[in-house]
């Protein structure tokens, strides 16, 4: 037999808190336990679930957990079933709600001297006790002119007067807890002698020199007074108007009319109503002057056929907010179709070439109208006017390759040379029409050129081969001035190229023939042993049949190359003494000597009093200082060659003689003593 060791029992529970209905069973065989609520099986949820044989509640719910719970134990083998005693919850709760008007039916019906009943919609179990408040102050039962019915949860004001006006709230408490009204009620019972608003002035936007009207009306018993003030608190009456409100009129019904409005009239206008009793009522309205700014410029737009594009028109700043519309060819665009207006946007769907043109965005308000044009170009793929042709260009001359195309917008042309983009520099120039100019054609310009003409719609390209027509030229041109060393062997080369191999011949400029020791061998002038008479002007002549002949003039100088007779030596000098660096060179023409010290050429005209270069080339430095130390280079040069030699100069402190050293002991290094 199934026996309940523990049975569920009815109990108090708090809304939203934990609870447990216990159930424990003993049986000879295995049994399974489940729960019923009002006879229906209880399904487990996160809030309410079986915990062993017991039923656990994470948060008691006064609606879902009201009813009778029963624990059922069943032996599935024998089919025996046992049910526990019934158990239920006495759920304690409290729930906030609003303060509502119970009587009269609507706020509009509340009049002075009528009865007003308010209800506090806080509920709970056990029934709570209620406390009413006006403007936060508790109302005690039995005070004059109001009664509190705790049972009804009502507050009755009998009769209601202006003194009852205020914010009504309620609170309730019970064994469960406390709650206050979720929404309070404002009771407003007017004193007929208080001014009340009948018509409030509204903000106005007007165009300059137009008129503006503000309406304002109050009511009270007896009738209230009404006064208009402008920003600076200056009263506006038909008798006394401020200087800047000469065109203001106050009508008997309280309306204020301003004519020919100017910027100084803009601002805040106050309408003040004053009853026999009560505070003044101040109503404000602003007069704005209508304005509209300029519109930003549009960049021209380039679109491709077949695409969908949008152009946004940013309306200009203005008051009131300007309205915006698009026009094309003087016609306002529709709000649907292929080319239409959507909001502030111009939409062009599936663009056609015929859509090109000027579109105008208009913006307007009270202050006026603004417009801005946008030029829309529908790009086309370029077409050829003249393709680049295979060309033969002459070396050294300018060469031109055409690439003439047409399209909308004007196509961009770029050129490639051997697949490499040509960037404009001193040799290459691309004209506005696409023609490529090679400023001075070189032999290596003979290659493939490709031009590409593009618009946003697409591009076309063509290529051409350039053949360079070589000119007859010296390679390289002989040096116009050359030196030969006297009594030595010398050669003067001359070579040239052309379409046909040129013949090269040397001759003396005076027309005299070359002496027997001078030979002209395949363009190289060879001097077996240079004599003084070999100096002079020579001409190298290169010629071939088709291209004629070219000449190069060379002036040959016979020289004795430079040698140093005296070279400067490594020198050490005491500080304050004089240093002498000797240098003498010979050669023909007679060499000139220059000195370089501390990596700069010593200019004889700017040496100063301490330094001097003698006629023979020697350098003298008086009163030497440590900063004079360093390498000094003697450079000998003439029109034929240049030679240099260098030596270091050391400047040292003069030593103090030690007693051990005799007066005649030599210094440990080569010295110049002066």
């Amino acid at each position: 037999a199934i026996v309940f060791i523990k049975q569920p029992s009815s109990q108090d529970a708090l809304q939203g808190r934990r609870a447990l209905l216990r159930c424990e069973v003993e049986a000879p065989g295995p049994v399974h336990v489940y729960w019923l609520l009002d006879g229906a099986p209880v399904q487990d949820t996160e809030r309410r679930f079986a915990q062993g044989s017991s039923l656990s509640f994470a948060a008691v719910d006064r609606l879902q957990d009201s009813g009778t719970f029963q624990c059922v134990a069943r032996d599935d083998v024998t089919g025996e079933e046992a049910r526990s005693a019934n158990a239920s919850f006495n759920i304690k709760w409290i729930e906030a709600g609003p303060v509502v008007l119970k009587h009269p039916a609507s706020e509009a019906e509340i009049q002075p001297q009528t009865q007003v009943t308010l209800r506090c919609h806080i509920d709970g179990h056990p029934r709570p006790t209620y406390q009413w408040f006006r403007d936060g102050t508790p109302l005690s039962d039995g005070q004059s002119n109001h009664t509190v019915s705790s049972k009804e949860r009502n507050l009755t004001l009998r009769p209601a007067g202006p003194e009852h006006s205020g914010l009504y709230s309620c609170c309730a408490h019970s064994a469960f807890g406390q709650a206050c009204s979720s929404q309070n009620f404002t009771l407003s019972i007017a004193d007929e002698s208080f001014a009340r608003v009948v018509l409030a002035p509204q903000d106005v936007v007007v165009a300059r020199y137009e008129e503006a009207m503000f309406h304002c009306q109050f009511s009270a018993q007896p009738p209230p007074s009404l006064q208009w003030l402008f920003e600076d608190e200056t009263p506006i009456t038909n008798r006394s108007r401020p200087p800047h409100l000469r065109r203001a009129t106050v009508f008997a019904n309280g309306s204020l009319l301003l004519t020919q409005v100017r910027p100084r009239n803009a601002g805040i206008y106050r309408c003040i109503g004053q009853g026999q009793r009560g505070p003044p009522i101040i109503l404000e309205a602003t007069l704005h002057l209508a304005e509209i700014e300029d519109m930003p410029l549009f960049e021209p737009r380039v679109f491709t056929a077949g695409s969908e594009e949008r152009v946004t028109c940013l309306p200009p700043k203005g008051l009131p907010e300007p309205s915006v519309w698009w026009e094309h060819a003087g016609v306002r665009l529709p709000t649907h179709g292929r080319v239409y207006q959507k909001g502030h946007e111009l939409v062009l769907a599936n663009i056609a070439e015929s859509d090109a043109g000027v579109y105008t965005c208009h913006a307007a308000n009270l202050a006026g109208q603004r417009r801005q044009d946008v030029n829309i170009t529908v790009a086309t793929v370029p077409s050829w006017l003249k393709k680049p042709q295979d060309s033969q260009l002459e070396e050294g001359k300018p060469g031109y390759l055409d690439c003439l195309t047409q399209a909308t917008p004007k196509p961009t042309v770029v050129w490639y040379r051997n697949q490499m983009l040509i960037s404009e520099d001193s040799r290459f120039e691309v004209f506005k029409n696409g023609t490529l100019r090679i400023n001075s054609v070189e032999v290596y310009d003979g290659t493939w050129y490709r031009c590409m003409s593009s618009t946003p719609a697409g591009s076309i390209e063509a290529q051409a081969r350039v053949q360079v027509l070589e000119k007859l030229k010296f390679t390289p041109p002989p040096q116009p001035q050359q030196c030969m060393e006297f009594d030595k062997e010398a050669t003067v080369p001359c070579s040239a190229t052309g379409r046909e191999k040129p013949t090269i011949k040397w001759e003396r400029a005076d027309g005299s023939s070359l002496p027997e020791w001078v030979t002209d061998n395949a363009g190289t002038l060879h001097f077996a042993r240079v004599t003084r008479d070999d100096a002079g002007n020579y001409t190298c002549i290169a010629s071939n049949g088709p291209q004629g002949q070219i000449r190069a003039h060379v002036q040959l100088t016979v020289a004795v190359f430079i040698t140093f007779k005296v070279e400067p030596e490594r020198t050490t000098v005491y500080q304050g003494h004089t240093a002498l660096l000797q240098c003498e060179a010979q050669g023909d023409p007679k060499p000139l000597i220059q000195w370089k010290g501390k990596d700069r050429i010593l200019d004889p005209t700017k040496l100063g009093p301490r330094m001097h270069i003698f006629q023979n080339g020697s350098l003298v430095i008086h009163d030497v200082a440590p900063e004079d130390s360093g390498r000094y280079t003697c450079i000998a040069g003439n029109s034929c060659n240049i030679k240099h030699t260098e030596a270091p100069l050391y400047v040292v402190d003069k030593p103090v003689p030690e007693e051990s050293e005799g007066p005649g002991s030599p210094p440990p290094y080569k010295m110049i003593q002066t």
């Epitope: 033969q392 002459e394 070396e395 050294g396 053949q467 027509l469 000119k471 007859l472 030229k473 379409r499 046909e500 013949t503 011949k505 001759e507 002549i541 010629s543 071939n544 049949g545 088709p546 291209q547 004629g548 002949q549 070219i550």
Partner: antibody, heavy 121, light 107 residues
């Protein structure tokens, strides 16, 4: 102005030689090649060869190789063309022409007035 | 050697006519083609050099064009003194060679 003046007409027997002169004036003689061109009666122009007055170097058309000799005398700015072993086929007007050029190519300008050589037995 | 072929060999035209003579090279000669005019009993006279450059003193009614292998000499409005034989000549390579000539006769 630039001018080339040729020697007068010649009548020669077959097998003989003829030497035609061409005197240049109005420019530096050694700066330009002198070419020789002949024209048989009623025929077109036929190039014979050139001489460089500067170096004396020559270049002859294959057809005349071994039979033609071109020389010059720079002191009198004159070029000569000698044709040997004459036959009746050599009857023609012989022109000398200066070869003007620009370093890329050239052209014949001006031409001598022509020398008529008649070969007849 | 480069062969030069002129066409037509002869043509008849009237004063004021536009005349075109063509010259074709057996291989590309770039722009190195010259045109000469020869009147009876006179030496040839240079008209056009390097295909399209007009020799000084030559009337502008003579124009040359072409490059590579095909060249044209045009006389825009034939004058009485233009009745002569015209020769083309290449100076691209040695030996220089002439076309066989085109004789322009009075119609």
């Amino acid at each position: 102005q630039v001018q080339l003046v040729q020697s007068g007409a010649e009548v020669k027997k077959p097998g003989a030689s003829v030497k035609v002169s061409c005197r240049a004036s109005g420019y530096t003689f050694t700066d330009y090649f002198i070419h020789w061109v002949r024209q048989a009666p009623g025929q077109g122009l036929e190039w014979m060869g050139w001489i460089s007055p500067n170096s004396g170097g020559t270049n002859y058309a294959q057809k005349f190789q071994g039979r033609v000799t071109m020389t010059r005398d720079t002191s009198i700015t004159t070029a000569y063309m000698e044709l040997s072993s004459l036959t009746s086929d050599d009857t023609a007007v012989y022109y000398c022409a200066r070869y003007d050029y620009d370093g890329y190519s050239g052209w014949f300008d001006p031409w001598g007035q022509g020398t008529l050589v008649t070969v007849s037995s | 050697d480069i062969q030069m072929t002129q066409s037509p060999s002869s043509l008849s035209a009237s004063v004021g006519d536009r005349v075109t003579i063509t010259c074709r090279a057996s291989q590309s000669i770039a722009i190195y083609l010259n045109w000469y005019q020869q009147r009876p009993g006179k030496p040839p006279k240079l008209l056009i050099f390097t295909a399209s450059s007009l020799q000084s003193g030559v009337p502008s009614r003579f124009t040359g064009s072409g490059s590579g292998t095909d060249f044209t000499l045009s006389i825009s409005s034939l004058q009485p003194e233009d009745f002569a034989t015209y020769y083309c000549q290449q100076s691209y390579s040695t030996p220089p060679t002439f076309g066989q000539g085109t004789k322009v006769e009075i119609k």
